[in-house]
Amino acid sequence: TTTEVVMENVTAFWEEGFGELFEKAKQNNNNRKTSNGDDSLFFSNFSLLGTPVLKDINFKIERGQLLAVAGSTGAGKTSLLMVIMGELEPSEGKIKHSGRISFCSQFSWIMPGTIKENIIFGVSYDEYRYRSVIKACQLEEDISKFAEKDNIVLGEGGITLSGGQRARISLARAVYKDADLYLLDSPFGYLDVLTEKEIFESCVCKLMANKTRILVTSKMEHLKKADKILILHEGSSYFYGTFSELQNLQPDFSSKLMG
């Protein structure tokens, strides 16, 4: 099953432990379960102490939908994901969802071990699922170049990967995990545009089509394909709706949101 996500009037503040929280979130494989029992994620009136990183955020994603989250640097995009993961506690509001979360950080990481071990990452092995993920994340060609194929060792004492390869393996790890909600935090930052387009289509739009997905992105092409769009500005929700609704805000949209 996939999850529905709801956030209502959520406000959140970073406290002094921001650094530790962030590091923890980067490494977190998000096996936590919530027991709402209604297969949904809900975000309502959420805030943190001090200067709020999120202020009165509201949205609802139906199960199987893609929510694109955009905004300038520091707008609160990653903080929003932290709140959903439970790494950042809201001072106000409600978040509702159920099921497992898989998180792909904008900072890709590789552990010492084989490519396969890096993708499976402790989850039970399913050949068909694994092959589907490898293909969707454009890793087949990379793997085929190694004599050891996906048993090539990475990390300490192993081969060095390019930034793009690291990014694709990190994404594959997140996608391989059988979760109810997938949080993808700018996963294409280290990919060339051709690879990014292919992976967005084959992985995010096709392979994960029936999964609930939240994608942090700045690309208009991604916003066009999303079921819903949330644009954050200085921690607040400037816009929430569909791409066609966003277009209807022009030119007001442009004049107000520049800067």
């Epitope: 905004g71 930034g163 700045s218 690309k219 442009s254 520049m258 800067g259």
Partner: nanobody, 123 residues
Framework: QVQLQESGGGLVQAGGSLRLACAAT????????MGWYRQAPGKQRDMVAF???????DYADSVKGRFTISRDNARNTVYLRMNSLKPEDTATYYC?????????????????WGQGTQVTVSS
């Protein structure tokens, strides 16, 4: 509104060098990734090299150690230094940039491509 203009292509003998440049002009707020891609006749367009705003680079295996990508953020320009050129490097080279126009709020970006510059390496 926004344009990418490549320059520096031409005819060169195998083993020679070229330096391509691509300047983005127009109403530009911010440029994220910039890169070079090439397309030989009858083949698909492939990535050659790209560079993030922070300077992280990636290269196609076939050009590693021979080509170097760099960028000048102040001039909105990306360069490709091509050394030890081979006949198989012959192609039209296209510049790409992910750009946030000034009319786009919140640094929302679009993909832009140049018209291409021809590189021919003779044996």
């Amino acid at each position: 509104q926004v344009q990418l203009q490549e320059s520096g292509g031409g005819l060169v003998q195998a083993g020679g060098s070229l330096r391509l440049a691509c300047a983005a002009t127009g109403s530009i707020r911010n440029i994220n990734t910039m890169g070079w891609y090439r397309q030989a006749p009858g083949k698909q367009r492939d990535m050659v090299a790209f560079i993030t705003r922070a300077g992280n680079t990636d290269y196609a295996d076939s050009v590693k150690g021979r080509f170097t990508i760099s960028r000048d953020n102040a001039r909105n320009t990306v360069y490709l230094r091509m050394n030890s050129l081979k006949p198989e490097d012959t192609a039209t080279y296209y510049c790409h940039a992910e750009i946030a126009e000034r009319s786009r709020p919140f640094y929302l970006t679009d993909d832009y491509w140049g018209q291409g510059t021809q590189v021919t390496v003779s044996s």
